[in-house]
């Protein structure tokens, strides 16, 4: 557990022509506030919700009213730090998104109106417990200067706030005021207690009793803002000029790196590590361009068409935002049809289809006959990616689940009597008629209108012949139906199992990519 802290130093028009004179619209006064959003900077295959590490909103700043003809100054800012508590380990790599919002205080219907003025995005590697990191970012014509750090909250310690220091019941080898740090018995740690009165906002300490100042602040308790004109060339949060860092003999003393660059000493000289968008020996050259790679997640950077935007990011699938920093939950659009399970693998969407469906979006219905869809001995007839059931006599409906009266349609001709039977129906024909449906007249001379009867069937016994014929036809049909059903089911199951094994293999490969 710990806290991420963000200190906004200044927000105002950036250098160069075309800088805005006021953050307010023509409708009247406004005030600023900030929103910070933290996202773990893991490989983007790991799906995460927006601001998964947390977010915070600042208080509203003082009301700003544009002075006619006056140049836009550093704008009045809200007081205090923005603090984002985190419960679990500090990830080390993270995306920091800072939004500057404008609250218009003119006569608005329904209360104040809010609009996003600027958004900056920074992907950083930062150890917990380290010193404040300072940065300057441009967002269109605006410039934001800020510092940030991550610190653990006891009993958590370490660069990821994962080690816990707890007092032990056993006697400790550590000196007074120190406690052993689990899991290493011989390691003793004490939370650094800064010098009394050390500024909470502008100072920090790594050793007990010290008070080290955040860049731009000086004095024994870090209460005195450094002069911006003769020293660092940085706009501080106050126009008061009451102090200045005096460069010492070291090449990095006084920090020769402008625009938030960090200085490291080299033999007889220094080297500036510049924040994104600044270059030169002293980070004095500014302006973010496509060559800086401002688009996250592989986004395509295109030079902006208007002077206010130096570039535009064209994002890969699954990402959005001015810098492609926002992950889109593409599964929320429910692209998988027929109840398929959606998997957003980051670089691709995969649909895990329910049995009987296939295709990239589970759009193909395979459940023609594989799912034994026809009940009560009905046979499944395939066609055009769909299926229909040819029902056994006595059953009806889409899946042959509805019991039907086979005699309801009066199927026996010429006054024959209909009897429902387990395999369908049987007609008892009136004298003078024969056939499965009593459709053939028997001539008086004993010769029917049928072709010659097979041996063993006497034309003089039409009812018996009809019943036998019906039973034989029905039995053959049932046996044939069962054979066809078994063969087609085996074929389909083999095909489906093969497809399933292939799909599972592909998905396993994708998830391990």
């Amino acid at each position: 557990a710990g806290v991420f802290e963000l200190q906004i130093h200044s927000f105002g028009p950036g250098p160069g022509p075309g800088a805005p004179r006021s953050p307010c619209s023509a409708r009247g006064p406004c005030r600023l506030f900030f929103r910070v959003c933290l996202k773990p900077g893991l490989s983007e295959e790991a799906a995460e919700s927006p601001c998964a590490l947390g977010a915070a909103l600042s208080a509203r700043g003082p009301v700003y009213t544009e002075q006619p003809e006056a140049p836009a100054p550093d704008l009045p800012l809200p007081n205090g730090l923005l603090q984002v508590p985190f419960r679990d380990a500090w990830p080390g790599t993270f995306s920091l998104i800072i939004e500057t919002w404008r609250e218009e205080l003119g006569d608005q219907i329904g209360g104040p109106a809010w609009s996003l003025l600027a958004r900056v995005t920074r992907r950083r590697r930062l150890a917990a417990g380290g010193p404040w990191a300072r940065d300057i970012q441009r967002a269109g014509a605006w410039e934001l200067r800020f510092s940030y750090r991550a610190r653990c909250e006891l009993p958590a310690v370490g660069t990821a706030c994962t080690r816990l220091c707890r007092p032990r019941s056993a006697p400790s080898r550590c000196g007074p005021g120190l406690r052993p740090c689990a899991p290493l018995e011989d390691e003793c740690e004490a939370p650094p207690v800064c010098r009394a009165g050390c500024s909470l906002e502008h100072g920090f300490c790594e050793q007990p009793g010290e008070c080290r100042c955040l860049e731009g602040w000086t004095g024994p308790l870090c209460m005195v803002p450094v002069s911006t004109s003769s020293c660092l060339g940085l706009r501080g949060p106050s126009s008061t000029t009451t102090g200045c860092l005096v460069p010492g003999p070291g090449p990095c003393d006084g920090n020769p790196c402008a625009n938030g660059g960090s200085c490291s000493e080299t033999p007889g000289s220094f080297e500036c590590t510049c924040p994104r968008g600044f270059y030169g020996l002293r980070c004095e050259v500014s302006g973010v361009t496509c060559a800086d790679g401002p688009c996250f997640n592989g986004g395509l950077c295109v030079g902006g068409a208007d002077p206010d935007s130096a570039y535009i990011c064209h994002c890969p699938p699954g990402f959005q935002g001015s810098n492609c920093e926002k992950r889109v939950d593409r599964c929320s659009l429910q692209p998988c049809r027929n109840g398929g399970l959606c998997l957003d693998l980051g670089h691709a969407l995969r649909c895990r289809c329910r049995a009987g469906f296939a295709g990239p979006r589970c759009e193909h219905d395979l459940d023609d006959c594989a799912g034994r869809a026809c009940a009560n001995g009905g046979t499944c007839v395939e066609g055009g990616g769909a299926h229909r059931c040819s029902c056994a006599l006595g059953f009806g409906g889409r899946n042959c689940r509805e019991r039907a009266d086979p005699c309801a349609a009066r199927p026996c001709a010429h006054g024959g009597r209909c009897y429902a039977h387990f395999s369908g129906l049987v007609c008892a024909c009136a004298p003078g008629y024969m056939g499965a449906r009593c459709e053939f007249p028997v001539h008086p001379d004993g010769v029917s209108a049928l072709p010659a009867a097979p041996p063993g069937l006497r034309p003089g016994d039409p009812q018996r012949a009809g019943v036998i014929a019906v039973i034989v036809v029905v039995v053959i049909a049932i046996v044939a139906g069962i054979v066809v059903l078994v063969i087609s089911r085996k074929k389909r199951m083999a095909k489906y199992e093969k497809a399933e094994i292939k799909e599972m293999g592909e998905m396993h490969r994708e998830l391990n990519a």
Partner: antibody, heavy 117, light 107 residues
């Protein structure tokens, strides 16, 4: 001006190995995804693999045809991306290009790899 | 993998002609299609991204259109420097895949 310069191509026997390099200039290299794309003689373009950023733990992705044989790495301090090719096959013969980003916006001039006995 | 089928594989045209090249995806790729131009012995250059957006520095005679599965690259008035091979590529689904190319030759 953005420049990507590949090197390391040459003639190698089947089963052999080769390491290609691509040096970038004119861009903040450490902020760019890097890809290798190849083109067999007289054929079309085929994506080979990709390496992402330090903040992505240098995640790599490969085409099925090269998985397990090719390895991509990068050295941000040298503005360089590498393609280590092992167990080479005749069908790996191609011009190999390094490109940036997800949409292959910047391309190098290419280096030729010939796998033949 | 998504297949991209380009047609024609080659065409002959004269300077000033209007040229249309089509690309068909084996499944829906939204508008995540790019077009590249490659001259003999040179590396490909990005012309169009997002199906219809011209990349920085690309002349206005090049335009792209389409969405879903059918895409078109149009050169409104062919110039001598446009004789080259053109490739479409899809970026909707990983891995990215390309069409077989269309060679535009002088008639």
């Amino acid at each position: 001006e953005v420049q990507l310069v590949e090197s390391g191509g040459g003639l190698v026997k089947p089963g052999g190995s080769l390491r290609l390099s691509c040096v970038a200039s004119g861009i903040t290299f450490s902020n760019f995804w890097m890809n290798w794309v190849r083109q067999a003689p007289g054929k079309g373009l085929e994506w080979v693999g990709q390496i992402r950023l330090k903040s992505d733990d240098y995640a790599t992705h490969y085409a099925e045809s090269v998985k397990g044989r090719f390895t991509i790495s990068r050295e941000d301090s040298k503005n360089t991306v590498y393609l280590q090719m092992n167990s080479l096959k005749t069908e790996d013969t191609a011009v190999y290009y390094c490109t940036t980003g997800y949409y292959f916006d910047y391309w190098g001039q290419g280096t030729t790899v010939t796998v033949s006995s | 993998n998504i297949q991209m089928t380009q047609s024609p594989s080659s065409l002959s045209a004269s300077v000033g002609d209007r040229v249309t090249i089509t690309c068909k995806a084996s499944e829906n790729v939204g508008t995540y299609v790019s077009w590249y131009q490659q001259k003999p012995g040179k590396s490909p250059k990005l012309l169009i991204y997002g199906a219809s957006n011209r990349y920085t520095g690309v002349p206005s005679r090049f335009s792209g259109s389409g969405s879903g599965t059918d895409f078109t690259l149009t050169i409104s008035s062919l110039q001598p420097e446009d004789f080259a091979t053109y490739y479409c590529g899809q970026f909707y689904s990983f891995p990215s895949t390309f069409g077989g190319g269309t060679k535009v030759e002088i008639k």
